[in-house]
Interface confidence: medium
């Protein structure tokens, strides 16, 4: 069954149940419900999922049974709207239930919350987790899906099934190990970090589709797939792009059953046709479905064909450039992007898209000129500064990272970004700057040829986090401008921001800089976050503080925490020494 073929199914719910199987069906419905109703208790969701599953089974038995012909949006929306506490818990989201499909589903989508007010997930003791796993494995794994899905309402659902499979494997193996903690904790840390990264990458795909449209997503996909599969023909890449766009449109739109089903079809197609796609797919294609799809999504770039001719012949020197462009603009631009991307695995996708945009703008102007060829003859020269800008930026920042190490590099970015957009909330600035800072350890170790795609495409993902968090509570016109004007120019837009001279410094509040003995029991990461929170607040109070002033205050702060954590009476130390530190800091910064 092709990704586009839709046989005439009398019952869509029966069709998906049969295609996906009961286990995946139930898991995906749970994810869908948890991503829509993020505050509902676990037990309520399980009850709803069981009801939907029982209904689906009646439709499998008889597709003509009552309500079996209804769309999935109608069935799921009706079910969500039965939740008794909808208005108390979700406020205006309850108004969605007064709407008809498809408006009702659009309404639910608009109420997805990227930063839900949910408690941080605290990891219980290993023995407690293993007991819970053994007592009721099914509930334990459902709880995992529920907790991740409600905190990450755009998590790529079929990929979450893959994470759950790994989560289960970790507990199955480690709960029998001699040292359960040594076995399990590193695996859970890895899943947590990979999960956050996966969530953020998918959030960018959904933002791309929802804020900039299908054309923007397809352009991204053409560039990325052409880098990954440089031996595949344009027609093959185009087919994959069309199918991939459908899969992500479905998942981002809450159509998780269709999305998972179509993703499986796409993996099947790729593996059946790997000889005309890539030589790197063999190992992926030998794996079971969830692993296979994940593996294909992460597969390394194939080798470039050796005999690729110069691009200039077809896209600059040819007499038919304007004729070909006029006949089918997007197809011709797609071919340009494909040809450029397959030759440049060393460029970031966003850079390739900037080049394609420049080429498009040039053709729009020149094909209307008296002498088109004379006008566009030097178009490739316009690419040089666009290529050099990210190259230079990455070089400078990798040098700074190697000089400072990750924590201090994050601090440099915290100061830089707080000065650029001081209106943004402190938790958001800390989270985003910490993630921006991770680009160093993630990408600077790579050779030159891999640095740019690693760094700039990762930065696009992180800056999208800033954009979606800011969109919920907009406080800065500069952030709104960089986030909404151009998807591919977000990073250059933020890089170009200077200190915000219009910002009125925050009033000094001693409470912000009052610390207690509980800081001593925090993990190293949590302690760093506390210190980085204080750093952001300092910059908000004194945006014109120099690096040297801020460094001095932060060094004093680190010494203060270290001293008081070693003291016998920690709380007294924090109270007394804290007052001295605040006074000294105010003096040092002239507050």
């Amino acid at each position: 069954r092709g990704v586009f073929r839709r046989d005439a199914h009398k019952s869509e719910v029966a069709h998906r149940f049969k295609d996906l199987g009961e286990e995946n069906f139930k898991a995906l419905v749970l994810i869908a419900f948890a991503q829509y109703l993020q505050q509902c208790p676990f037990e309520d969701h399980v009850k709803l999922v069981n009801e939907v599953t029982e209904f689906a089974k009646t439709c499998v038995a008889d597709e003509s049974a009552e309500n079996c012909d209804k769309s999935l949006h109608t069935l799921f929306g009706d079910k969500l709207c039965t939740v008794a506490t909808l208005r108390e818990t979700y406020g205006e989201m309850a108004d969605c239930c007064a709407k008809q499909e498809p408006e009702r589903n659009e309404c639910f989508l608009q109420h997805k919350d990227d930063n839900p007010n949910l408690p941080r997930l605290v990891r219980p003791e290993v023995d407690v987790m293993c007991t819970a796993f053994h007592d009721n494995e099914e509930t334990f794994l459902k709880k995992y899906l529920y907790e991740i899905a409600r905190r990450h309402p755009y998590f790529y659902a079929p990929e979450l099934l893959f994470f759950a499979k790994r989560y289960k494997a970790a507990f199955t193996e480690c709960c029998q190990a001699a040292d359960k903690a040594a076995c399990l904790l590193p695996k859970l840390d890895e899943l947590r970090d990979e999960g956050k990264a996966s969530s953020a990458k998918q959030r960018l795909k959904c933002a791309s589709l929802q804020k900039f449209g299908e054309r923007a997503f397809k352009a991204w996909a053409v560039a990325r797939l052409s880098q990954r599969f440089p031996k595949a023909e344009f027609a093959e890449v185009s087919k994959l792009v069309t199918d991939l766009t459908k899969v992500h449109t479905e998942c981002c739109h809450g159509d998780l059953l269709e999305c998972a089903d179509d993703r499986a079809d796409l993996a099947k197609y790729i593996c059946e046709n790997q000889d005309s796609i890539s030589s790197k797919l063999k190992e992926c294609c030998e794996k079971p479905l969830l692993e296979k799809s994940h593996c294909i999504a992460e597969v390394e770039n194939d080798e470039m064909p050796a005999d690729l001719p110069s691009l200039a012949a077809d896209f600059v020197e040819s007499k038919d450039v304007c004729k070909n462009y006029a006949e089918a603009k997007d197809v011709f631009l797609g071919m340009f992007l494909y040809e450029y991307a397959r030759r440049h695995p060393d460029y970031s996708v966003v850079l390739l898209l900037r080049l394609a945009k420049t080429y498009e703008t040039t053709l729009e102007k020149c094909c209307a000129a008296a002498d088109p060829h004379e006008c566009y003859a030097k178009v490739f020269d316009e690419f040089k500064p666009l290529v050099e800008e990210p190259q230079n930026l990455i070089k400078q920042n990798c040098e700074l990272f190697e000089q400072l190490g990750e924590y201090k590099f994050q601090n440099a970015l915290l100061v830089r970004y707080t000065k650029k957009v001081p209106q943004v909330s402190t938790p958001t600035l800390v989270e985003v700057s910490r993630n921006l800072g991770k680009v160093g350890s993630k990408c600077c170790k790579h050779p030159e040829a891999k640095r740019m795609p690693c760094a700039e495409d990762y930065l696009s993902v992180v800056l999208n986090q800033l954009c979606v968090l800011h969109e919920k509570t907009p406080v800065s016109d500069r952030v709104t401008k960089c986030c909404t004007e151009s998807l591919v120019n977000r990073r250059p837009c933020f890089s170009a921001l200077e200190v915000d001279e219009t910002y009125v410094p925050k009033e000094f509040n001693a409470e912000t800089f009052t610390f207690h003995a509980d800081i001593c029991t925090l993990s190293e990461k949590e302690r760093q976050i506390k210190k980085q929170t204080a750093l952001v607040e300092l910059v908000k109070h004194k945006p014109k503080a120099t690096k040297e002033q801020l460094k001095a205050v932060m060094d004093d702060f680190a010494a203060f925490v270290e001293k008081c954590c070693k003291a016998d009476d920690k709380e007294t130390c924090f109270a007394e020494e804290g007052k001295k530190l605040v006074a000294a800091s105010q003096a040092a910064l002239g507050l």
Partner: nanobody, 119 residues
């Protein structure tokens, strides 16, 4: 619905010329590579020539220098100019939409046009 319709075949003497045409519809013609494939009486299919979306051309050694493939994207038409024809060029010539080149895969074919080279 994708359709490919060949024309221009016929009887020609050795050393003569013919021009085959293939009218395409039902898809974005300029987005795809197109090819000519032939089948001689009692033989298997033989690839003749391919033209890339942007104009690059590829030929089988047996026809190189004698045949020229071309396309007119504005007319959604593929051509094969055949010069210096030989008896061994006798075959049914099919126009095909290329899905991949490594290895060659074609997802749509025309019904074919017969070329007979004989004195």
């Amino acid at each position: 619905e994708v359709q490919l319709l060949e024309s221009g075949g016929g009887l020609v003497q050795p050393g003569g010329s013919l021009r085959l045409s293939c009218a395409a519809s039902g898809f974005t013609f300029m987005a795809y590579q197109m090819a000519w494939v032939r089948q001689a009486p009692g033989k298997g299919l033989e690839w003749v020539s391919t033209i890339h979306q942007t104009g690059f051309t590829y030929y089988a050694d047996s026809v190189k220098g004698r045949f020229t493939i071309s396309r007119d994207n504005s007319k959604n038409t593929l051509y094969l100019q055949m010069n210096s024809l030989r008896a061994e060029d006798t075959a049914v010539y099919y126009c095909a939409k290329v899905r991949s080149m490594r290895p060659y895969k074609f997802d749509y074919w025309g019904q074919g046009t017969l070329v007979t080279v004989s004195s």
